[in-house]
Interface confidence: low
């Protein structure tokens, strides 16, 4: 599923991401834009053999199990395939764990490079939330 900007903002808000661990909703929508272009089925292979999955490109080295990543920790205790669902519940719950793990949203390279320090509220402007 490819979400619309406001559609994703509403879904993320419904799942409790607005101001979760201090990060406003715009940060999450911005991260999803530059990680996956709002596509829940996005996958990208990394040079270390791990893969990033889903709308927030969650990595199989640490957070989920795809059965092919050596030394995977699977800290979210989920199959990586769950992160590709059109239902973003699994991605959101795992993201909550990631953002709470000490580095905040710096865990997402795209957020660091494209969203951090910018007017992220622009990503939810005009949305009925």
């Amino acid at each position: 599923k490819v979400f619309g900007r406001c559609e994703l903002a509403a879904a993320m808000k419904r799942h409790g991401l607005d101001n979760y661990r201090g990060y406003s909703l715009g940060n999450w929508v911005c991260a999803a834009k530059f990680e996956s272009n709002f596509n829940t089925q996005a996958t990208n292979r990394n040079t270390d053999g791990s893969t990033d999955y889903g709308i927030l490109q969650i990595n199989s080295r640490w957070w989920c199990n795809d059965g092919r990543t050596p030394g995977s920790r699977n800290l979210c205790n989920i199959p990586c395939s769950a992160l590709l669902s059109s239902d973003i519940t699994a991605s959101v719950n795992c993201a909550k764990k990631i953002v709470s793990d000490g580095n905040g949203m710096n865990a997402w390279v795209a957020w660091r490079n494209r969203c951090k320090g910018t007017d992220v509220q622009a990503w939810i402007r005009g949305c009925r939330l």
Partner: nanobody, 121 residues
């Protein structure tokens, strides 16, 4: 402010059952890994069980597997521990706790005040 309030402890005969409850406030338990830890008289803390925030996984210490069941009711913001086939060695103060994020074997960062379970005939 995070608060955890346990209830449901008491005296029960061997082979009996109890259900412990933990009412949480100051946060949503659906966002957290939540667990139960116990301390038997004169002994150290023993991890009993926890439930992952994503709802996929529950974990149990070997000593309680098959007898205890952890669950939660997100609408009531309450965690439960159903304890069946209780044994004398289950006698302890049981603490509800919020698990630290990120690491499966990490510790707990918030605790309740505990509820005493005594298994005796």
């Amino acid at each position: 402010e995070v608060q955890l309030l346990e209830s449901g402890g008491g005296l029960v005969q061997p082979g009996g059952s109890l259900r412990l409850s933990c009412a949480a406030s100051g946060f949503r338990i659906s966002d957290e890994d939540m667990g139960w830890v116990r301390q038997a008289p004169g002994k150290g803390l023993e991890w009993v069980s926890y439930i992952d925030n994503n709802g996929y996984s529950t974990y149990y210490a070997d000593s309680v597997k098959g007898r205890f069941t952890i669950s939660r009711d997100n609408s009531k913001n309450t965690l439960y521990l159903q304890m069946n086939s209780l044994r004398a060695e289950d006698t302890a103060v049981y603490y509800c706790a919020k698990k630290q994020y990120g690491y499966q074997n990490g510790g707990f960062d918030y605790w309740g005040q505990g509820t005493l379970v005594t298994v005796s005939s």
